[in-house]
């Protein structure tokens, strides 16, 4: 029988009263066959961390910081359950911190050295952790003590709990820097007065305080955000301007042999017995005998942490960077102008070897990290541990959703100006072969399918949103007989059909051969009766034009394509017999490294791009033999955006509607834990 | 295609050198880029340093200011100087030219490179 107990951890007397009581009203509502509680007193939350690494607790809720202490080694914990406010409806798990600043003032991000500085508190996350974590290595040397470097960097602060007598700058604005709120700058509402009344000219607090503090929009329009791209936006902007996004209150659990899932199904039970409003004798969100037992006071309820989140993500870039900063003390050398190496992201081994060899050629400008899949990428991007990569359209979406920035298009048709003149896209086409005469877009059920990879855009996102506007369901995999279409469940029928062997069977990358157009287009050729491609892909393994065996002797002319509306076309007909336009793949990367990828590729393309004429002896970008490697093989060039500079702009509101309708047929657990943050 | 064969490896002491080989059965002056690789056991394979035609190198940061690759083009062969070594060089090391295509894996038998006191 499983153990089906969870051991919660206590930090006091008080919490650990409230842990019997939650223990035995829980017995009293649930069967014997439930979940049950148990409880273990621990004398503080880093004794209660340890613990559960330990294995002799289960489950505790953190604050963010210590989140991100549970998270290092040898801890190794994980976000579960979040603790949400607001209402079920709208429920918040996040907040924003913010620099506030007034609309005439004129200066950015990176021009806050010499300003007057209003912070909530000396520790506090909003107003002290957060900012100066993210200024740390703008902090006049030596950093420590951290608060004289701070002194020293604005040129009058009000940090309440601050020691006026060793650093008075932190104090100047606030005579003593009282810790109450008999301070009348202190905690939220204290620093944006302290902004309000002209003392300071930034206030870093959390996003809701603007609102709390001024009820009327017209006064709220005379401040404005600080963004971390060095630009402002208005107040109501802070899901897209802020310095991090904080969860509230979260419970951690291991990471292996966690018990996820079974705390979730008690948390789950509890609020539904016990949560706000529903029971007089116990009350999960209420502390009787102290403050915030167990869970916040003011929570509302609890919401389960999608299981592909680690901690560096629940966290955020932002926040683990200002947090580890502060903790770490460490910067580069010397801050300088120059764009440190861009790290770019590798799919399995075969784009290692070509991007292994575009870092020797890049001397050093290029740096390679590789992943498994491509959403291991995105999350690598994400976290700071690799820059930048080219996505398929489908995975731009995705990577927008996870807060990514569109830098670069690729382009495929030659023109003069190809870097400044980003195309409007590609073609989604089905393909089909001529012998299969009767073949219509119509009657392609019981059919065997060829997919790119799921989620991409002329493999998956476009045909598969087609059929489900016909068929108003997810279940594709009944729809087909067989098929390959990399990235699905390894049991599924659109695996059946992949070549890949052993535990590459139907991975999304090159180790699987069926991978991708070229791979799709393949799966066509031996095996299946469509393929779900882009409109080059047939010219370009036709003709004698891809060299390996299976493709050396096809002819372009033994394929056709489906209209939708149930005829068939020649394939050079594309124009008038397609699926969709499709987005063009496109670089991706962080906002902060927005500018260096931009200038290093820009840079890079004019030395390894389509200029070169002899790819046999020279590195060339763009050319991997039809394997599309880190870059599609008939990229002309990588084109500016301009102010295409969103997911959303870059993909269209058509296309963004289409994956979006798509989402409840979605496989992605990097969109699910990404859409958690930011819904 | 060239075939490339390893040599030079063997057992060191921390702090020792070694110089490995890459003799390939062919002309390298047209091959773009030449590299060094390693693999130690259960770990994924890597990059350690590289040359390009023009000479241009690059390393590992692991290695760098211990190791130097190089080439003579008229011996048609690739060099690793490997100085002050440590335990955690201990691998196999393998030389390729990336001219065989990147999604078919070209490897030599490779050379033996072992740090032990």
């Known amino acids: 029988v499983p153990d089906k107990t969870v051991r919660w951890c206590a930090v006091s007397e008080h919490e650990a009263t409230k842990c019997q009581s939650f223990r035995d009203h829980m017995k009293s509502v649930i069967p014997s066959d439930g979940p049950s509680v148990a409880c273990v007193k621990k004398a503080s939350y880093l004794d209660c961390i340890r613990a559960i690494a330990a294995n002799e607790a289960d489950a505790v809720t953190l604050d963010a910081g210590l989140v991100y202490d549970a998270y290092l080694a040898p801890n190794n914990l994980k976000p579960v359950v979040a603790e949400f406010y607001g209402s079920k409806e709208d429920p918040q798990t996040f907040y924003y911190a913010v620099a506030v600043v007034k609309k005439d003032s004129g200066f950015q991000m990176n021009q806050l050295r010499g300003k007057k500085s209003c912070h909530t508190g000396l520790g506090r996350s909003a107003g002290w952790n957060i900012p100066i974590g993210l200024l740390y290595c703008d902090l006049p040397e030596p950093r420590k003590p951290l608060e004289k470097a701070v002194a020293n960097f604005f040129s009058g602060s009000c940090a309440p709990c601050a020691d006026g007598t060793d650093f008075p700058q932190l104090c100047q604005l606030c005579p003593g820097c009282g810790c109450s709120t008999l301070n009348q700058y202190f905690g939220y509402s204290g620093a944006f007065k302290c902004l309000k009344d002209g003392a300071g000219d930034v206030a870093f607090v959390k996003h809701s305080t603007i609102f709390e503090n001024l009820a009327n929009k017209a006064d709220r329009d005379q401040y404005e955000l600080l963004c971390l791209d060095n630009t402002r936006k208005p107040v109501d902007e802070y899901k897209d301007c802020h310095l991090a996004q904080v969860p509230s209150h979260t419970v951690v659990a291991r990471s292996m042999g966690g018990k996820e899932d079974l705390i979730w199904e008690l948390l789950n039970q509890a609020q539904e017995h016990f949560g706000k409003d529903k029971s007089k004798e116990f009350q999960l969100f209420s502390s009787p005998h102290g403050k915030d037992l167990l869970f916040k006071d003011s929570a509302h309820g609890f919401l389960k942490v999608p299981p592909r989140m680690d901690a560096k993500m629940y966290l955020g870039y932002e926040y683990v960077t200002a947090i580890r900063n502060l903790r770490e003390g460490t910067c580069p050398e010397a801050p300088t102008d120059e764009c440190k190496p861009v790290k770019w992201c590798a799919l399995s081994h075969h784009e290692r070897l070509k991007c292994d060899e575009w870092s020797v050629n890049s001397v050093g400008k290029i740096e390679c990290v590789s992943a498994e899949t491509t959403e291991d990428c995105i999350a690598k991007i994400m976290n700071g541990e690799a820059d930048a990569m080219s996505l398929d359209g489908g995975f731009v979406y995705i990577a927008g959703k996870c807060g990514l920035v569109p830098v670069l298009a690729e382009n495929y048709n030659k023109s003069d100006n190809c870097e400044d003149t980003p195309e409007a896209g590609y073609f989604a086409i089905a393909v089909v072969k001529k012998s299969a005469s009767d073949l219509t877009w119509d009657n392609l059920k019981g059919k065997k399918s060829c997919h790119t990879a799921v989620g991409r855009t002329a493999g998956w996102n476009i045909p598969m949103g087609l059929l489900y506007n016909k068929i108003n369901h997810c279940r594709f995999d009944e729809f087909f007989s067989e098929g390959c279409a990399p990235g699905s469940k390894k049991d599924s029928s659109l695996c059946k059909l992949c070549m890949g062997s052993g535990l590459n069977l139907c991975e999304p990358n090159n180790k699987e051969g069926y991978y991708g157009y070229t791979g799709a287009f393949r799966c066509l050729v031996e095996k299946g009766d469509v393929a779900f491609v882009k409109h080059q892909t047939v010219p370009q393994n036709t003709g004698g034009k891809n060299p390996d065996p299976w493709a050396k002797n096809l002819n372009e002319k033994d394929y056709e394509l489906l209209c939708l509306d149930g005829t068939r076309k020649p394939v050079e007909e594309y124009a008038n017999c397609h699926l969709a336009r499709a987005p063009n793949h496109a670089v991706v990367t962080r906002k902060d490294k927005e500018a260096c990828v931009h200038k290093i590729l820009r840079q890079q393309q004019h030395l390894f791009g389509s200029n070169v004429t002899d790819c046999s002896g020279n590195f060339c970008l763009f050319r991997s033999e039809t394997k599309d490697l880190l870059f599609r093989d008939d990229t002309v060039c990588l084109a500016k955006l301009h102010d295409r500079n969103t997911y959303e702009k870059y993909l269209g509101e058509e296309y963004v509607k289409a994956v979006g309708n798509l989402r409840k047929c979605s496989t992605s657990s990097l969109l699910e834990a990404c859409t958690f943050r930011r819904p | 295609q060239v075939q490339l064969v390893e040599s030079g490896g063997g057992l060191v002491q921390p702090g020792g050198s070694l110089r490995l080989s890459c003799a390939a059965s062919g002309s390298i002056a047209s091959i773009n880029t030449m590299a060094w690789y390693r693999q130690a056991p259960g770990k994924q394979r890597e990059l350690v340093a590289g040359i390009t035609r023009s000479g241009t190198t690059t390393y590992a940061g692991s290695v760098k200011g211990r190791f130097t690759i190089s080439r003579d083009n008229a011996k048609n062969t690739v060099y690793l100087q490997m100085n002050s070594l440590k335990p955690e060089d201990t691998a196999v090391y393998y030389c390729?030219?990336?001219?065989?295509?990147?999604?078919?894996?070209?490897w030599g038998q490779g050379t033996q490179v072992t740090v032990s006191s």
């Open positions: 390729t030219d990336y001219s065989s295509s990147y999604y078919q894996d070209y």
